[in-house]
């Protein structure tokens, strides 16, 4: 759909990972002085919903509040921006939003190896495991958008895993890692401990996750 | 003015398939929502399932899942219903209704109808 | 067997007040707002009342809707001759994931 108008941001207020009963705030906005904003969860008929937006400083927007948060508000959304009503124009639409809904199921454990003070330079995997069945596990590191995402591989020891290759360490973060199914991938478990990782030898305590550009061309290590 | 404007009415076997058309004229037609809905002589409403043509978005009723399905094609404003492995209980009149974006479900305009009969 | 539940049937005389009942459940009416539609002899239902009790332009303020838990009524004032019609409610169902309709109720003007 191209729209007669530029596409719309959408953005999660306080992040697109939401906990079974909290509510996020979708804020969809523009430079496009939009008198509505529709916000679209994919595949459904019924629920667009519908605000007048808002003008500021030659900002239009629009704060949607989902929530409380149950896994049929989780999914993927788009907003779209109107200048008219009956019949809507709609702009193009913004990217997707992926909406998360976590707090499911139990939390897996998540360690590093080969722990979690390491030297610059080098080599850190972290690991993430469960007793529960999980298909997928994802990896946050505080302060990130995105998550990456590994299967998990067959049980050993009684516990499903995913490692996640971190490379040569530069700096540190705190990282947190969820399970889920299949079937379900917009339903995460319990957030694991988070997990401080620090970086021996560098100044700095942030660390490139592995969602960031690897080297300067910016391209992308998308581990999905 | 807004107007819905349907294909004529049909005689169909049992076991085969069936597909109405509904254009619409009077309004942008990607920008709302198209449900059908049909009715038995004599008998009551039945919600068989919509389209949202801008978001490529089609809902079913559970009754009609894998039996129906909805199109349309925003060249020609024209929405597409079609039902296939008709039986006798088939027999109805089948409405196209349009509704808003936000209020998909609310039917504002209904079209004239067509008149489905299913009979060996 | 419609999921929402109606009176088949309703009268009265030119002038009476005129309740037509709604009948659902948490998933339907509980958690969702109620249409009324009216459908004369012959031709296409037509809205008459939205999100429980809106009258869209051009219908007299003789008819009026109204929710209450997982029940909703439509009530027709001073009726007359031409309010013969059948009339059905309408509400989104979330465990069905489908708008639902009542059987409808056919209303009849005594003379």
């Known amino acids: 759909h191209e729209g007669v108008h530029r596409k719309p941001s959408l953005l999660a207020h306080p992040g697109r990972l939401v906990k079974s009963e909290e509510t996020v705030i979708l804020q969809c906005w523009s430079d496009v002085r939009f008198e509505h904003f529709l916000l679209h969860r994919e595949g459904k008929f019924k629920d667009t919903l519908h605000l007048i937006g808002e003008h500021h400083d030659g900002v239009s927007k629009a704060n949607f509040s989902i929530g409380p948060m149950m896994q049929d508000l989780a999914g993927t959304y788009r907003c779209y921006g109107s200048v008219t009503h009956s019949p809507y124009q709609l702009s193009a639409p913004s990217d997707p939003l992926d909406i998360v809904i976590t707090g499911l199921y139990e939390k897996p454990s998540l360690s590093a190896q080969p722990g979690p003070t390491v030297l610059a330079g080098e080599s850190v995997t972290l690991s993430c495991s469960s007793r529960s069945s999980y298909d997928m596990y994802h990896l946050s590191r505080e302060g990130e958008a995105h998550e990456c995402r590994f299967s998990a591989g067959p049980k050993v020891n009684g516990t499903f895993q995913a490692d996640f290759p971190l490379g040569p360490a530069t700096h540190g973060g705190t990282y947190r890692c969820f399970g889920s199914f299949r079937d379900s991938p917009y339903e995460w478990s319990n957030s694991s401990d988070p997990l401080l990782v620090s970086v021996i030898g560098n100044p700095s305590n942030s660390w490139p996750s592995p969602t960031e550009p690897s080297s300067k061309t910016g391209n992308p290590r998308h581990l999905h | 003015e807004v107007q819905l404007v349907q294909s004529g009415a049909e005689v169909k076997k049992p076991g085969s398939s069936v597909k109405v058309s509904c254009k619409a004229s009077g309004g942008t037609f990607s920008s709302y929502a198209i449900s059908w809905v049909r009715q038995a002589p004599g008998q009551g409403l039945e919600w068989m399932g919509g389209i949202i043509p801008i978001f490529g978005t089609a809902n079913y009723a559970q009754k009609f899942q894998g039996r129906v399905t909805i199109t349309a094609d925003e060249s020609t404003s024209t929405a597409y219903m079609e039902l296939s492995s008709l039986r006798s209980e088939d027999t109805a009149v089948y409405y196209c209704?349009?509704?808003?974006?936000?209020?998909?479900?609310?039917?504002?305009?209904w079209g004239r109808g067509t008149l489905v009969t299913v009979s060996s | 067997q419609s999921v929402l539940t109606q009176p088949p049937s309703a009268s009265g005389t030119p002038g009476q007040r005129v309740t037509i009942s709604c009948s659902g459940s948490s998933s339907n009416i509980g958690s969702n707002t109620v249409n009324w539609y009216r459908q004369l002899p012959g031709t296409a239902p037509k809205l008459l009342i939205y999100?429980?009790?809106q009258r869209p332009s051009g219908v007299p303020d003789r008819f009026s809707g109204s929710k209450s838990g997982t029940s909703a009524s439509l009530a027709i004032s001073g009726l007359q001759s031409e309010d013969e019609a059948d009339y059905y409610c309408a509400a989104w169902d979330d465990s069905l994931n489908g708008v639902v309709f009542g059987g409808g109720t056919k209303v009849t003007v005594l003379a």
């Open positions: 999100s429980n009790n």
């Open positions: 209704a349009r509704g808003e974006l936000d209020t998909a479900i609310r039917f504002d305009y």
